[in-house]
């Protein structure tokens, strides 16, 4: 099925034309625009960026673009009373001090309101105390410290690579771990590749670069003080004692440079293995403590964050469709960022802008999509997605019964190797149709399509001739469309080929140096990977918003839905006894996908069949598919996340930037030798399976003929 | 119940290879390190090197300059140590060892004789 | 490589004295230091680790302590069953090594 019928307008207008408008030099121009000055949440000059895009959106032909603010928890360095750590000696006086701040970038020495390095929610706090590395903070290192090198991190301080998962989850760890404080730190064997200059020469980190981000575990709540509800003029607002997802001790990222002063002076036990050294030239020993002569020596953190309601601004554009005006396809994407925000987020920015031109171009001559498509730049990401959660919240019954897709537009860029899609299954063959059709920007690759360069650059590692596509996780602005309500989402960038460094970003991600010259000089000079990124995510929305049969495939979530099962079934196996002993079975898991399996291919068969020029037998068919994954929603939530309900996907426990797939099961399997009361546990086990068995079947049944 | 259980007893010739197994058993293999200890007649325990299951890195004593290799296969939860051009003082007990540093869990060991 | 070395080799004791073993590294291994017991014929079984913390189910009457170089493992009140050869390690620097055992009889 193609989006080449017009809707009130001549044949001209098809995804053609919408992709032959987009063009590179108005990415580059608008990358430029975004980029000159800091826009951090809660700013006055990201609240004048939103009016500016409000505006420019206007003008490029939307419907209406309207501001929605909400007063969300921020938080902040205290501007008079830095933030730093120091090594103390035994009489308490400060023998070194971590930097204040990062040197800035060469033209950008005058630039005012850089914030220092910070980590975003960390509480007020001066704990001093010995040091324990305890390599990336995952559950894994924690373990091997806790219980192969009994390494007890009570009362410590620990210091952690950033790197593998993300940082709130690293903090987490830290806390349940009984430490006093955390200090995260970038190593170069994460951050900086070898071969490569640091900036401004190249794109490595340099020593005094660091990492800003925020360090919560909101499990999908947004706003941490009134979860589940918008905050708005009359929100009531949870006391800070109640508030969500805030760490319980002291936080702060520290470069290189400064890690090389904390850690050559650790003692203590030799690392497990090689896997917990860096690069630095350091024994990368474990602690806990200084070493000889430095054992009196301590670690002190001096950190006087403060967090404050905010006011936050998302712009919201329409462009309202022409024969199903309810449906919406959505294209959102954060404006707000650390520093400058040269490539987070502001390469995805600037791609939006881009897009919104083009749809608006197009208007202009006459076109309207068939649905409606919105367009957000969401407030406050990097606070913990608040603005695009705020929005969803406020908006959550529209979006329920009205949303067909989100598309997300964060970084277009990670990396200049290959393209790297996200999805839910349904969107599968969507983005295998569109690359196909798209031509590769990649070098040795001319003349050929994106579809055939991504394959060959990024394989499926279960489907040969088939590129990589991964499952969603979170740490961006399509979790709450995704995990909350269930509506269809998926993102594209241009990504690096450094698979084993999946989830470290690159080196100088939330740092001062991701400027627009890091872009223009080092990481896509002619802009083509940002046009490439451009036509995927625009030709996504073109198409989802404008197909008369919506592009969806239910077939390949059965196909998954098999793969997961098996995925799970085998984890579980690895306690064929206890299995026995407690009947635990996953008959009515693998029936279940069985019958789905059987379901969505019958529905496939009548989907090629059905009379399409009957507009509510077309409205039909179409609501069944819009709807397929929102059945994948529990109401009830998963354990102790309630905001997260989706039974097929949940960003990890361990690491949120990833994506587990039949979460529930998951986590109720892990570590699941070491739980007091095996019983429980194994009950727990088969209730997760009875509620994704059920789950599944109910998802089935959506797909069956109505009557 | 945790068990590791190593391989046979061997006798090998001057400059031939050896290579000792130990299956891991009640408790997921990927968790923990495997060390390989040696203790010769009448010796000291020494260290050899260890591998993590999970990535598959080895880490070796230098002292064995390239003569011992470590490795693993998951799906079988086993991990193999083998120690190539063998020499008569290389006779000892070989032990696999869980841990990270520490020596908790012990394989029963596997006598390796060198004589010509 | 930071060498490990026990004293005395072997000692003779009667049930129920105080026995002390002691151990010297030849560089600062700062508390990383663990003993075990290897009875004849077994395998090494580990006492105590960090220097002075005893290893699950490991009797009271094991006690050790030190830092920097130099360490103790102490037997309070030996018992026939402490008849063994006791090794400390050092785990602060790779390579890990051992000292050279001390090997406990009974008078």
């Known amino acids: 099925k193609s989006s080449n019928e017009a809707t009130n307008i001549t044949p001209k207008h098809n995804m053609k034309a919408f992709l032959d408008e987009l063009k590179a030099e108005n990415i580059k121009k608008f990358l430029y625009n975004f980029t000159q000055i800091p826009h951090l949440a809660g700013t006055e000059q990201n609240f004048q960026l939103a009016k500016q895009i409000q505006s420019q959106w206007k003008e490029f032909g939307l419907d209406s673009v309207e501001l929605a603010h909400y007063d969300v928890l921020l938080s902040y360095p205290n501007k008079t009373h830095p933030n730093y750590i120091s090594i103390i000696n035994e009489d308490g006086n400060e023998i070194f001090n971590t930097s204040l701040f990062e040197p800035p970038p060469p033209g950008y020495e005058n630039v005012s309101d850089i914030v220092p390095p910070f980590s975003a929610f960390s509480p007020q706090g001066m704990p001093e105390g010995d040091l324990v590395y305890v390599n990336y903070a995952r559950t894994e290192d924690f373990f091997k410290l806790e219980r192969d090198m009994k390494i007890n991190c009570s009362g410590k301080i620990v210091i952690a690579r950033y790197g593998k998962v993300f940082r709130g989850n690293k903090v987490k760890n830290a806390q349940l771990a009984g430490a006093k404080g955390v200090i995260l730190y970038s190593d170069p064997a994460d951050y900086f590749a070898p071969g490569v200059k640091s900036y401004p020469d190249g794109w490595n980190l340099p020593g005094g670069g660091v990492q800003r981000g925020n360090i919560l575990n909101l499990n999908g709540a947004g706003d941490p003080l009134t979860p589940g509800y918008p905050a708005n003029e009359y929100a009531y607002r949870r006391g800070i004692a109640e508030a969500v997802g805030l760490p319980s001790i002291p936080v702060h990222p520290i470069g290189y440079y400064d890690a090389q002063k904390l850690l050559e002076k650790m003692g203590g036990s030799a690392p497990p293995d090689s896997s917990w050294r860096g690069s630095l030239k350091v024994p990368y020993n474990v602690g806990p403590g200084f070493t000889g002569n430095f054992s009196t020596q301590k670690v002190k953190m001096h950190i006087h964050s403060t967090n404050e309601v905010t006011r936050i601004y998302n712009v919201i554009g329409t462009l309202r469709g022409a024969v199903e005006p309810d449906r919406y396809v959505i294209l959102g994407g954060h404006r707000d960022s650390w520093v400058f925000g040269g490539i987070d987020p502001q390469s995805g920015a600037a791609v939006v802008h881009e897009i919104v031109r083009s749809f608006g171009t197009l208007k202009k001559e006459g076109w309207r999509p068939r649905r409606t498509i919105l367009f957000a730049s969401w407030d406050a990401e990097e606070f913990g997605l608040l603005g695009s959660t705020e929005w969803a919240e406020e908006n959550s019954r529209l979006l329920q019964e009205r949303g067909v897709a989100y598309i997300n537009a964060d970084s277009s860029i990670e990396g200049n190797y290959t393209l790297r899609v996200d999805c839910t299954p349904l969107m599968y063959s969507l983005v295998h149709n569109l690359t196909k059709e798209l031509k590769s920007p990649d070098e040795g690759f001319e003349g050929k399509s994106l579809y055939e360069s991504w394959t060959k650059k990024s394989p499926s590692p279960e489907f040969s001739g088939m590129p990589r596509i991964s499952k969603l996780g979170s740490g961006n602005d399509f979790e709450v469309f995704f995990q909350r309500l269930g509506i269809a989402s998926g993102r594209a960038r241009y990504t690096k080929n450094w698979e084993t460094n999946k989830f470290s970003g690159y080196p100088l991600y939330h740092s001062v140096y991701e400027t627009y010259e890091l872009v223009e000089k080092f990481y896509d000079p002619m802009f083509k990977y940002h046009l490439t990124v451009a036509q995927v995510r625009g030709g996504m929305v073109f198409e989802l918003a404008n197909s008369i049969v919506l592009p969806f495939d239910c077939r390949d979530y059965a196909v998954v839905l098999r793969k997961y099962a098996d995925k799970i079934y085998s984890i579980s196996m690895k306690h064929p006894q206890e299995m026995k002993t407690y009947s635990v079975s996953f008959d009515s898991l693998f029936s279940a996908v069985k019958n789905f399996t059987e379901i969505a291919s019958k529905f496939s068969e009548r989907l090629q069949d059905f009379d399409k020029s009957n507009p509510i037998v077309l409205r039909m068919m179409n609501d069944q598919l819009m709807f397929l994954e929102r059945a994948f929603i529990d109401p009830l939530g998963l354990p102790d996340r309630p905001f997260y309900r989706h039974v097929i996907y949940a960003p990890s426990s361990h690491n949120k930037y990833a994506g587990e797939s039949f979460p529930g099961i998951y986590d109720a399997l892990f570590d699941i030798e070491s739980k007091v009361d095996p019983s429980k546990a194994w009950g727990e086990v088969k209730r997760q399976i009875y509620v994704a068995a059920f789950t599944v079947q109910a998802a089935a049944e959506t797909l069956s003929e109505v009557a | 119940e945790f068990q590791l259980v190593q391989s046979g007893a061997e006798v090998k010739k001057p400059g031939a290879s050896v290579k000792v197994s130990c299956k891991a058993s009640g408790y997921t293999f990927t968790d923990h390190n495997m060390n390989w200890v040696r203790q010769a007649p009448g010796q000291r325990l020494e260290w050899m090197g260890l591998i993590n299951p999970n990535y598959g890195t080895a880490d070796y004593n230098q002292k064995f300059k390239g003569r011992v290799t470590i490795t693993r296969d998951t799906s079988a939860s086993t991990a193999y140590m083998e120690l190539s051009s063998l020499r008569s003082e290389d006779t000892a007990v070989y032990y696999c060892?869980?841990?990270?540093?520490?020596?908790?869990?012990w394989g029963q060991g596997t006598l390796v004789t060198v004589s010509s | 490589d930071i060498q490990m070395t026990q004293s005395p080799s072997s000692l003779s004791a009667s049930v129920g004295d105080r026995v002390t073993i002691t151990c010297k590294a030849s560089q600062g291994v700062d508390t990383a230091v663990a003993w075990y017991q290897q009875k004849p014929g077994k395998v090494p079984k580990l006492l105590i680790y960090?220097?002075?913390t005893r290893h699950t189910g490991v009797p009271s009457r094991f006690s050790g302590s030190g830092s920097g170089t130099d360490f103790t493992l102490t037997i309070s009140s030996l018992q026939p069953e402490d008849v063994a050869t006791y090794y400390c390690?050092?785990?602060?620097?790779?390579?890990?090594?051992f000292g050279q055992g001390t090997k406990l009889e009974i008078k």
């Open positions: 060892a869980r841990g990270s540093s520490l020596f908790a869990y």
């Open positions: 390690q050092q785990y602060s620097r790779y390579p890990l090594t």
């Open positions: 960090w220097a002075s």
